[in-house]
Interface confidence: medium
């Protein structure tokens, strides 16, 4: 905050604006009768340099001329680009306690002359828009620089606009505010940009263009689509355009897609027929326009039209599977399962499924519709049965898919051989097998079926399955496969009228079980001990249990325990052991083993056999 220079003046030579690398002389002069009151000879003028309001240097040593008590001249060099403030102060040396008094100040600007503007580009948005040009100004000048945009054209058309750049704003675009009309389509126009500041001026090369070069049509608007006869695959796209448009580009894609379908349309007049759409699919449509077939620029893409195509009748074949369970001597329960069609096959919202069970010879037919993907019925055990299922949406139904109901595991000769299940990673299992050795009839297909081995899984959860062609002997199962869960996997070989199966258990990842089985009872029968237990709770098994181990040792003995290892069976919960001495008290416990290791021991039970040694 320098007071209006009452005490004196500061001047700069050659000028307060200098080119980068130049030196300047700053003179500070006191006005008559100003200065230190008693001893004019004690007047000392000092010059301080400030950058961004911060004192950076006292230029006491840069004095080149001193008229004692009245004026001093300082030389300043190596000034950086931009603005630097110099303040002259008076220091009365006889009064040490008083701070120097400001006399006057000056700002010196260091910069460069403007470079010729380059890369001029002009556009007019729409037939009714105005011409706006932009350019590259080149290096920053660090000075206030004025730019003038001049346009000249036919019929003595001239027009100019100005703007400036400084440290707060940049000028590299100007709107001339004039509209070029289509009747000037063949005319040539010239624009030039001139730049000027305190250190010099420069001018761009002239830039020549025509109406077609610079006019960018407005993007099409009011886009809509009309589906012919409510077709899901054919529709007419309609839109509004500027009058001079001769070429359109259309792009469209399903919403979940990553690549556009592109179409060029000449003289479309706001209308185009599309014939390859997918029914019941959310689409996005956009359109761009051009005023000339060969020259000119494309408009920006229009706003998106998003719409769903209408439904058409389903076309897919349902993947059907079933389970058979005998209820009593003359009745069986058939549970049919099928997989939902994928969207491209369903072609609409599936409203229901039509299910038919038919006894082939007696022509008995059971029919029903369901909204679920399974259906259960009790039917006689006699006769040859066939099932069919079709899917229906609002436009119609798919062709029914048929399957013969056979005894899935009834033919031992059709059982696949050497079935193995190997964990591939956290969420899939590789199942391999060998074909049946002595099949009477040809294998038409294999079905790999799997289900988590947890309580109630047969009733609560439908099976998962894969259809495998007869020449394949492996399947990678991944649907609904979770780590640390044991799955029962069945490989079915199906011929036209028979089925054979083999079963195996498998997991995608395993750990040692969390706990061991709980011994619930020890009973003695006919000189043998029967150990009974409850299985480990399902979440604690952590994979497929391979074995249970029963350990025993004499109470208070420090010897290593004996063990009996038995193959795990879900249905088994007791086992005999026969190598214990009578009238000796034993401690018994159990563990469980997965492929990853052995569980901690379960509860301990004491028992003293009474019978004679075996």
């Amino acid at each position: 905050n320098i007071d209006v220079c009452k005490l004196g003046t500061v001047t700069v030579q050659p000028a307060p604006v200098i080119p980068l690398g130049s030196a300047a002389n700053i003179s500070c002069s006191l006005n008559p009768k100003q200065g230190c009151s008693h001893y004019p000879s004690s007047n000392e003028l000092i010059l301080l340099k400030f950058v961004n309001d911060v004192l950076v240097e006292n230029l006491h040593g840069k004095k080149v001329h001193d008229h004692t008590g009245h004026s001093s001249t300082f030389q300043v060099t190596n000034l950086s680009l931009g603005m630097t403030l110099f303040v002259c102060k008076l220091n009365c040396s006889n009064s040490q306690k008083k701070p120097p008094v400001p006399v006057c100040g000056v700002e010196i600007s260091v910069g460069v002359a403007p470079e010729p503007p380059q890369n001029i580009s002009c556009v007019q948005e729409g037939e009714n828009g105005t011409v706006a040009c932009s350019w590259n100004s080149g290096k920053v000048t660090y000075l206030k620089t004025n730019y003038t945009l001049q346009l000249s054209g036919p019929n003595n058309l001239t027009c100019q606009k100005q703007c400036f750049s400084d440290n707060r704003q940049n000028c590299n675009r100007l709107d001339l505010g004039i509209n070029l009309s289509p009747d000037l389509a063949e005319s040539r126009f010239i624009v030039r940009v001139t730049a000027i500041n305190d250190l010099g001026n420069s001018s761009s090369l002239p830039h020549t263009f025509t109406f077609l070069d610079i006019v960018i049509p407005l993007p099409p608007w009011d886009i809509r689509i009309n589906f012919l006869n409510a077709s899901g695959s054919r529709g007419t796209l309609q839109w509004e355009d500027e009058g001079q448009v001769v070429l359109n580009q259309l792009r469209y894609q399903p919403l979940n897609s990553t690549s556009w379908n592109m179409v060029n349309a000449t003289n479309a007049k706001g209308k185009y027929d599309l014939r390859d759409l997918r029914p019941f699919t959310e689409y996005e449509f956009q359109i761009s326009s051009k005023l000339h077939l060969s020259g000119g620029s494309w408009s920006n893409w229009s706003e998106s039209l998003r719409t769903r195509t209408p439904e058409e009748e389903p076309v897919g074949i349902l993947d059907i599977w079933y389970m058979k369970q005998d209820i009593d001597y003359d009745r069986q329960q058939i549970s049919l399962f099928w997989k939902s069609l994928n969207p491209s096959e369903a072609r609409g919202k599936i409203l229901h499924y039509q299910v038919t069970l038919q006894e082939v010879t007696k022509k008995t037919t059971l029919q029903n519709t369901t909204r679920h993907t399974s259906w259960t019925r009790v039917i006689p055990r006699t006769g040859a049965w066939t099932a069919s299922v079709s899917a229906a949406n609002s436009k119609g139904a798919s062709a029914p898919t048929h399957i013969n109901i056979v005894d899935l595991c009834g033919t031992g000769l059709l059982a696949p051989h050497q079935v193995s299940a190997k964990s591939e990673n956290m969420d899939n299992i590789l199942v391999t097998w060998q074909p049946p050795k002595k099949a009477d009839s040809a294998v038409r297909e294999y079905i790999v079926e799997w289900r988590a081995l947890q309580p109630g899984s047969i009733t609560k959860f439908p099976p998962h399955w894969l259809r495998i062609p007869p020449d394949n002997m492996s399947a990678l199962i991944s649907e609904n496969i979770k780590p640390y869960i044991c799955y029962e996997i069945r490989v079915h070989a199906l011929s036209e009228s028979q089925g054979g199966c083999s079963s195996i258990r498998g997991d995608s990842k395993h750990k040692a079980p969390v706990s061991g089985p709980h011994i619930t009872a020890i009973t003695e029968k006919k000189e043998r001990l029967f150990i009974s237990w409850t299985h480990i709770p399902f979440p604690e098994q952590r994979g497929c249990i391979l074995h249970y181990r029963i350990y025993w040792k004499e109470r208070d003995s420090t010897a290593q325990p004996e063990l009996c290892e038995i193959q795990y069976r879900r249905s088994q919960n007791s086992h005999p052991i026969s190598s214990l001495q009578p009238r000796v008290t034993y401690v018994l416990w159990m563990t469980a083993v997965t492929a990853a290791g052995e569980s901690p021991q379960g509860n301990e039970r004491e028992f003293c056999p009474q019978g004679k040694a075996n």
């Epitope: 004996e562 063990l563 009996c564 290892e565 193959q567 086992h575 083993v593 492929a595």
Partner: nanobody, 126 residues
Framework: QVQLQESGGGSVQAGGSLRLSCAAS????????MGWFRQAPGKEREGVAT????????YYADSVKGRFTISQDNAKNTVYLQMNSLKPEDTAMYYC???????????????????WGQGTQVTVSS
Amino acid sequence: QVQLQESGGGSVQAGGSLRLSCAASGITYRGVWMGWFRQAPGKEREGVATIYTGSGHTYYADSVKGRFTISQDNAKNTVYLQMNSLKPEDTAMYYCAARTVGGTFYTLAADSFNTWGQGTQVTVSS
């Protein structure tokens, strides 16, 4: 196809030591029971020691506890029987065995094992 090959047998004075090796091929899963059994002329085959290769659990017949040690080298698929303080009653044909089937298993019962080697003779003289 699992195959077992024993080696290391021979003649030794009482109080001496021998180390038997059993090289297994064709075993692809992580944990199996393997064991050493012996049969002296005119006697039944008896269990000497067994080991579960998955965890290193070991079991010994009372007659060899403290003198014999069963161990494994999983990298080489080999099971060893280190026999120290040998006695004349240890003289027998020594067999290596592996259990590669399911069913019930008892620690030192020969009928719990289904795959056998050819055997190696151990003779201890006084």
